[in-house]
Interface confidence: low
């Protein structure tokens, strides 16, 4: 059945032991009950008990309390099962009878007599709460309570919804109080037969056959199947679709196993120096002023950066340096002049203008010259026009960019990669042009791959005097002299203190 109407008899009082017809029972009213449950009737009529009927054995004599009993004869509460949708309304007839016969089956005995009867018509919703009532007439009183509950696996306001919990291939659910399915943890769908995969499992690339798993489809991997599997053997690469191998930054080769970016991966250059991915070791360090060594790990003399201006000579000190200035100059870097226009201090055709009532001067320089005495050619590299770490070089009235390996273009703005095999010998710089790599050779070398040693060396003739150190410049014919303390001049030929009868060159 879909539900049960339960009637709990609690107490029956018939103190005088009287029948409905006014006669008394001898020796007392041996009382049993007949219950008839039927559809709601505004006026109760005889006829079939459409919702069910039940009889009790003899429960007591005259007045008695009815105890609860769960099984066997005389069960209380009384059970009236039904197998239809509970309509929410009902009519109930409870009759008390006296029997002179069998206690257990008084219904079959002849000579039964009616003691009293009550009729209840009402509305009753399905629920676990008992509705308690008491009915009196002139001779008797009956206390009772009743309710309607759903049978096992039936739910809802009218016990019309069948739901049987299950946990098998066809579904994984329990039943809600209203009979709707409540999926067990990890299951979803109308019938709770679809597993809920691991949270985040990729919708297309992963699936599951039981809750909280994520099984990857071919070509995918990872806890959530959101990582593609690259080609077998791919070393330093990734994929966006399965079986790809797209190289990470700085790696080359079919399987991304060739290191093109030693500088990035190993950072061999020290003290702020610039690392270039070129040379026989896969890198070259370009040191900042004041440092030397293969990795720029060695500190140079503090004077190495030539801090003294206007021909001043530099002397190292413990943590600093000292500039010895030529006549007519003073200041930490010999940057201030004691000259006036009378001393003709402006070089390269510069015009002299007196200042501060003739105690100082200012030079107005012609085009392409600058400096306080017009002693410097204009450096067109000050605007840092070379990109990607290119070195700027002044070439007469113009300038050029010397690009790092892997870059080309007027401003080194174009990225190239043909120089990866470092074809330039003797530290030559490789430029990858349309027709193949071109090498820019260091001083003393030439040839397409800098493989030819040049015998002519501008420093070979010893152009620097007074023990000065000679450095080869940007071209083999150029040189620079680094003067020892006490000497000045482009070849360090003048001892400090001689009157200037020549133009100073910074």
């Amino acid at each position: 059945g879909s539900g049960i109407f339960q009637l709990r008899l609690q107490e029956f009082v018939n103190q005088r032991g009287m029948l409905a017809n006014g006669q008394s029972c001898e020796p007392g009213c041996r009382t049993f009950f007949r219950i008839c449950l039927k559809h709601f009737q505004a006026t109760f009529s005889e006829g079939p008990c459409t919702f069910g009927n039940v009889s009790t054995p003899v429960l007591g004599t005259n007045s008695f309390v009815v105890r609860d009993k769960n099984s066997g004869s005389g069960r209380n509460p009384l059970q009236l099962p039904f197998n239809f949708t509970w309509p929410g309304t009902f009519s109930l007839n409870i009759q008390a009878w006296h029997t002179p016969g069998d206690d257990l089956r008084p219904e079959t005995s002849p000579g039964n007599s009616l003691i009293s009867q009550i009729i209840i018509q009402g509305s009753l919703a399905v629920g676990k709460i008992w509705r308690t009532d008491e009915q009196n007439d002139t001779l008797t009183r009956l206390s009772y309570s009743y309710r309607v509950i759903c049978s096992d696996n039936y739910y809802g306001e009218s016990c019309s919804r069948l739901c049987k919990k299950r946990d098998d291939h066809f579904g994984h659910y329990e039943c809600q109080p209203d009979g709707s399915l409540s999926c067990l943890p990890g299951w979803t769908g109308k019938y709770c037969d679809q597993p809920i995969c691991l949270s985040g499992c990729h919708e297309q690339n992963g699936y599951c056959s039981k809750p909280d798993e994520c099984i990857c489809r071919p070509g995918w991997q990872g806890r959530l199947c959101n990582e593609c599997i690259p080609h077998n053997g791919c070393r330093h690469g990734t994929c966006s679709i399965p079986w790809q191998c797209a190289c990470d930054e700085g790696w080359g080769g079919l399987f991304c196993d060739q290191d093109l970016n030693y500088c990035t991966h190993h950072s061999p250059c020290k003290n702020g120096s610039t690392c270039s991915n070129s040379g026989p070791k896969g890198y070259t360090c370009t040191c900042l002023p004041g440092y030397t060594g293969e990795h720029c790990e060695l500190g140079l003399s503090k004077c190495a950066s030539n801090p003294c201006r206007n021909g001043g000579s530099c002397k190292d000190q413990e943590n600093s340096y000292h500039c010895l200035c030529p006549p007519g100059y003073y200041g930490q870097h010999c940057e201030h002049s004691t000259l006036t226009c009378a001393d003709s201090p402006c070089f390269n055709g510069g015009s002299c203008r007196e200042r501060n009532q003739g105690s100082s001067y200012a030079c107005e320089c012609p085009p392409n010259f600058t400096g306080s005495n017009c002693e410097k050619k204009v450096d067109r590299c000050t605007s840092n026009p070379c990109a990607n770490g290119g070195q700027c070089q002044n070439r007469g009235p113009s300038r050029t960019c010397r690009c790092r390996p892997g870059f080309t273009g007027t401003h080194c703005e174009l990225h190239i990669s043909d120089c990866a095999r470092s074809p330039c010998a003797h530290g030559g710089t490789c430029h990858d042009l349309e027709n193949g790599p071109v090498c820019t050779c260091p001083a003393g070398f030439s040839g397409r791959r800098c493989e030819v040693r040049i015998t002519h060396d501008a420093c070979a003739s010893g152009p620097c005097f007074n023990g000065a150190t000679c450095y080869t410049g940007l071209s083999p014919n150029n040189f620079v002299c680094n003067c020892p303390y006490g000497f000045v001049g482009s070849r360090c030929e003048f001892p400090v203190g001689l009157p200037p009868s020549f133009p100073w060159v910074a």
Partner: nanobody
Framework: EVQLVESGGGLVQPGGSLRLSCTAS????????IGWFRQAPGKEPEGISC????????YDADSVKGRFTISRDNAKNTVYLQMNSLKPEDTAVYYC?????????????WGQGTQVTVSS
Amino acid sequence: EVQLVESGGGLVQPGGSLRLSCTASGFTFDDYAIGWFRQAPGKEPEGISCISSSGSITYDADSVKGRFTISRDNAKNTVYLQMNSLKPEDTAVYYCATPGIAACRGIHYWGQGTQVTVSS
């Protein structure tokens, strides 16, 4: 004999108002909870609202909250249902009922009902 007599029903346009009355007799009115339920044709009965003997109010139907108000006048043995902002879906027979106890717990007696029709 317990008697509950409803009145005040009728035809009303959507958005209109009605006030239903339920006059009780045959029992000590102050001691019982009284409520209203309704039943539309072909549908199950639907509880609307109930007021206990102490005056505490319960609403059974979310659909009427904010529109329907129940009140009681113990001196007149009468319970009222003020219905505002009526909708076509409020069309039903409205019954006054009592559980026969002080608290709003079920229906034991009810009246013959009064028809409310909401239509334009």
